[in-house]
């Protein structure tokens, strides 16, 4: 199926808590974080990044015509292509991954389609043929999701459907200082 893009723009998505939570508060302001509330992470931590957008999952909006052989949609459709980096995970709060984000390697997140939508389009064909209606499946939103053994590479390349399954839970280790109250909920969120 051929397509012609004649307009595109980008939207930065707000990641959902549990999959790819918002950056730590000090990325948004300069307040010192409370160690106890943040799983023992020191204030002014170097895990901050100077440019958050450098590691963001973006929704690129492409406007294109749907084609089917010689036929082309009467109006262009707008769909999303998921683009950008979901890592390094230094942007993830300490609660994710059982507070293990101090490790040198950890969960790999990818920017892939989250939701799809079906859109009905009218195809105009040359030679006076009657218009045809057709349903197309378009990416509606993107999300940073943890890479799992159930992802194959073609899904990632082609922005195919996500088949993630939560990792089997492991017992969290006790911490010397108190962690966030919702840490247990987040521990197996990915």
């Amino acid at each position: 199926q051929g397509w012609q893009a004649f307009k595109n723009d980008a939207t930065e998505i707000i990641p959902e808590l549990g999959e790819y939570p918002e950056p730590p508060p000090e990325l948004e302001n300069n307040k010192t974080m409370n160690r106890a509330e943040n799983g023992g992470r020191p204030p002014h931590h170097p895990f901050e990044t100077k440019d958050v957008s450098e590691y963001s999952c973006r929704e690129l909006h492409f406007t294109r015509y749907v084609t089917d052989g010689q036929c082309r949609s009467a109006k262009p459709v707008t769909e999303l292509v998921c683009s950008g980096q979901c890592g390094p995970a230094r942007l993830l709060p300490n609660a994710i991954g059982r507070g293990k984000w101090w490790r040198p390697s950890g969960p790999d997140f990818r920017c892939i389609p989250d939701r799809y939508r079906a859109q009905r389009v009218q195809l105009l064909c040359p030679g006076g043929a009657a218009p045809r209606a057709r349903k197309v499946r378009l990416v509606a939103s993107c999300k940073c999701k943890r890479l799992t053994r159930f992802h194959n590479q073609s899904e990632l390349k082609d922005f195919g459907p996500e088949a993630a399954r939560p990792q089997k839970g492991r017992k969290p280790r006790p911490r010397a200082r108190g962690a966030k109250a919702n840490q247990a909920e987040l521990e197996n969120a990915y």
Epitope: P88, R90, W101, P104
Partner: antibody, heavy 119, light 110 residues
């Protein structure tokens, strides 16, 4: 200049103990998670143990679990590895290493201290 | 035997492009980020690539990393004599609960 300097290595008999130290300078010590990585003569790298910024979360390789203990003293800018029940196969160059960003690899390394376990 | 598998050796001539592979499983590379280290003869290892494809400051852009499924690779373009070293891949292994290294690849610049 960011620096990690290991010490405490030496020749020891099997079954005995040894304590390695790693002194840090040139950076904010508790901004780094710290690790011990070893390299047997002519062999590859083997991760031994890791400890988070505050010393309250620790991981060990199966090969040293129950025998080695990692600890840190942020007030002294020091990392330690207490090695008990040493075996011949523990003979290696022991590196102290640190990572300053989550899931960002070991970006600071010391030059290593040699541990030889032999009778 | 290492959890991550690397070819023991690789070689190339100056200016050439060389790729070093690293094969793992679903419990390490398949789920977690990959890092690459360079160890020049007689020196401590140095971080070359983190988080699959990110370069620390100071590492030339001749070095690049990629990951696909349960394998990762390090590419070195415009090979130079000073690139002659041992290269190691590493990743966290969820089953072993350990940071695992590949066996290392000795790169020779001919």
């Amino acid at each position: 200049e960011v620096q990690l300097v290991e010490s405490g290595g030496g020749l020891v008999q099997p079954g005995r103990s040894l304590r390695l130290s790693c002194a840090a300078s040139g950076f904010t010590f508790d901004d780094y998670a710290l690790h011990w990585v070893r390299q047997a003569p002519g062999k590859g790298l083997e991760w031994v143990s890791g400890i988070n910024w505050e010393g309250d979360d620790i991981d060990y390789a199966d090969s040293v679990k129950g025998r080695f203990t990692i600890s840190r003293d942020n007030a002294k800018n020091s990392l330690y590895l207490q090695m008990n029940s040493l075996r011949v196969e523990d003979t290696a160059l022991y590196y102290c290493a640190g990572n300053s960003r989550g899931y960002g690899g070991l970006d600071v390394w010391g030059q290593g201290t040699t541990v030889t376990v032999s009778s | 035997q290492s959890v991550l598998t690397q070819p023991p050796s690789a070689s190339g001539t100056p200016g050439q492009r060389v790729t070093i592979s690293c094969s793992g499983s679903s419990s390490n590379i398949g789920r977690n980020t990959v890092n690459w280290y360079q160890q020049l003869p007689g020196t401590a290892p140095k971080l070359l690539i983190y988080s699959n494809n990110q370069r620390p400051s100071g590492v030339p852009d001749r070095f690049s990393g990629s990951k696909s499924g349960t394998s990762a690779s390090l590419a070195i373009s415009g090979l130079q004599s000073e690139d002659e070293a041992d290269y190691y891949c590493a990743a966290w292994d969820d089953n072993l609960e350990s940071y695992v290294f590949g066996g290392g690849t000795k790169l020779t610049v001919l």
